[in-house]
């Protein structure tokens, strides 16, 4: 079954290469287990950035080497991606699956365009 997922259109990463955005899903019921996948689309290529599952009210559990962290609040997931560089600029798409209880729902957002600007190197001091 399809589900609506909303996310901001544009986000600018900080000078430290950190970008945060909210992914909100219109849950038809009371999901207790949710899977969230962040995908990056650039030059018509789509790659998985990170994925996590969580029980409602708990922190998102990403893999140890993930560049993503996140928290959940109700039907909102607050995602943070770190270690971004200019070459990582692209459309970051939020995919949400309500895993339990049945029925299963899946929703895909329209994506958040994340712009990353590499900081200028500090000039050498004499």
């Amino acid at each position: 079954k399809a589900m609506h997922v909303a996310q901001p259109a544009v986000v600018l990463a900080s000078s430290r290469g950190i970008a945060s955005f909210v992914c909100e899903y219109a849950s038809p019921g009371k999901a207790t287990e949710v899977r969230v996948t962040v995908l990056r689309q650039a030059d018509s290529q789509v790659t998985e950035v990170c994925a996590a599952t969580y029980m409602m009210g708990n922190e998102l559990t990403f893999l140890d080497d993930s560049i993503c962290t996140g928290t959940s609040s109700g039907n909102q997931v607050n995602l943070t991606i770190q270690g971004l560089r200019a070459m990582d600029t692209g459309l970051y798409i939020c995919k949400v699956e309500l895993m339990y209880p049945p029925p299963y729902y899946l929703g895909i957002g329209n994506g958040t365009q994340i712009y990353v600007i590499d900081p200028e190197p500090c000039p050498d001091s004499d």
Epitope: L39, V46, E48
Partner: nanobody, 119 residues
Amino acid sequence: EVQLVESGGGLVQAGGSLRLSCAAPGRTFSNYAMGWFRQAPGKGREFVADIRWSDGRTYYADSVKGRFTVSRDNAKNTVYLQMNSLKPEDTAVYYCAAQGGVLSGWDYWGQGTQVTVSS
């Protein structure tokens, strides 16, 4: 159109095992993920397990974790669901599904195979 064909369902006693298979005859899987779902009478479709075709990463519903194993055979273009320690509450029609791509939903579905666990 991808045609998924399941097999391996049947009647088994509680504590027994079954292995379900899902194949796409005459087609090579290039799907992002393959999954298994089930539907008991009068209930919504429930996620059981899935496997990513590229790297074999798996994910299981809590209700089957430690009892069910999903696997794939690239050479045979087949996905399996090994079900051990079956319980009466596992009784349902089991469906195989495929995601056509990373940005897809579950685009393709099999016809379903009945699994009945008697106590």
